[in-house]
């Protein structure tokens, strides 16, 4: 079949890096500098995609392949293939319509992006405040108030940790 | 092909002024917010200013805020940054970027930006 088809349409031969030059008798010719063909058969290359301004090139553009864009220091990747870049803000912060701006008084962010979350409420877990929130850190809950009554028996000290992905012994 | 050309660059005293021009091509200019960054010689990029669509909000990092004036003409598909009192903490790389679809809702990426315009700001 391939054979066939290669008889009836010269460009199948063409291979990827190579465009069917309809102008010149359906000759595979190399694709023109800044584009690029990443499959055969193809009738023309496509432009290369330019990483500048907030992107950055993180993958040159070659005859068979696209460039690969990320994104300047100081902003972030979106969207599928890097296909925008977003401002970073410092922890503690967010990022709206006017920049970046701290995080209001009870809610927090510790990452350079995303939105700030309201710390957790220890008192619906039954527990008391054991650090408290700042806008880059949440609290950090304790014991309930009760466990740390005179008298009350002493808190058992939480096992120690275990690295992911880890079974016990 | 979708395109955008800075210019207006150039040396000036502190406390001079400049005006930087980004003329747009290749998508419906109006219908897209549009953000001015810019990169310091060494440091990273930084977001300067941005405009609504139809320039009905404008915004801007707090360190040109009063000194500086974004503004566009959806007639002549160009966006401008008026830059006054200049300093020499000014110079940099000045870049225009469209805002992706969906910027000032879901998100406030870029997915366009030209090639830039160098402004020196030094006596």
């Known amino acids: 079949f391939e054979r066939t088809r290669s008889l009836q349409d010269p460009c199948s031969n063409c291979p990827a890096g190579t465009f069917c030059d309809n102008n010149r008798n359906q000759i595979c010719s190399p694709c023109p500098p800044n584009s690029f063909s990443s499959a055969g058969g193809q009738r023309t290359c496509d432009i290369c995609r330019q990483c500048k301004g907030v992107f950055r090139t993180r993958k040159e553009c070659s005859s068979t392949s696209n460039a690969e864009c990320d994104c300047t220091p100081g902003f972030h990747c979106l969207g599928a293939g890097c296909s925008m870049c977003e401002q970073d803000c410092k922890q503690g912060q967010e990022l709206t319509k006017k920049g970046c701006k701290d995080c209001c008084f009870g809610t927090f962010n510790d990452q350079k992006r995303g939105i700030c979350r309201p710390w957790t409420n220890c008192s619906l877990d039954g527990k008391s405040v054991l650090v408290n929130g700042t806008k880059e850190r949440d609290v950090v809950c304790g014991p309930s108030p009760a466990d740390l009554s005179p008298g009350a028996s002493s808190v058992t000290p939480p096992a120690p940790a275990r690295e992911p992905g880890h079974s016990p012994q | 092909q979708v395109q955008l050309v800075e210019s207006g660059g150039g040396l000036v005293q502190p406390g001079g002024s400049l005006r930087l021009s980004c003329a747009a091509s290749g998508f419906t200019f109006s219908n897209y917010w549009m953000n001015w960054v810019r990169q310091a010689p060494g440091k990273g990029l930084e977001w300067v200013a941005n405009i609504k669509q139809d320039g009905s909000e404008k915004y801007y990092v707090d360190s040109v805020e009063g000194r500086f004036t974004i503004s566009r003409d959806n007639a002549k598909n160009s966006l401008y940054l008026q830059m006054d009192s200049l300093r020499a903490e000014d110079t940099a790389v000045y870049y225009c970027?469209?805002?992706?679809?969906?910027?000032?809702?879901?998100?406030?990426?870029?997915?366009?930006s030209g090639q830039g315009t160098t402004v020196t700001v030094s006596s």
């Open positions: 970027a469209r805002g992706g679809e969906g910027y000032g809702e879901s998100h406030y990426g870029m997915d366009v």
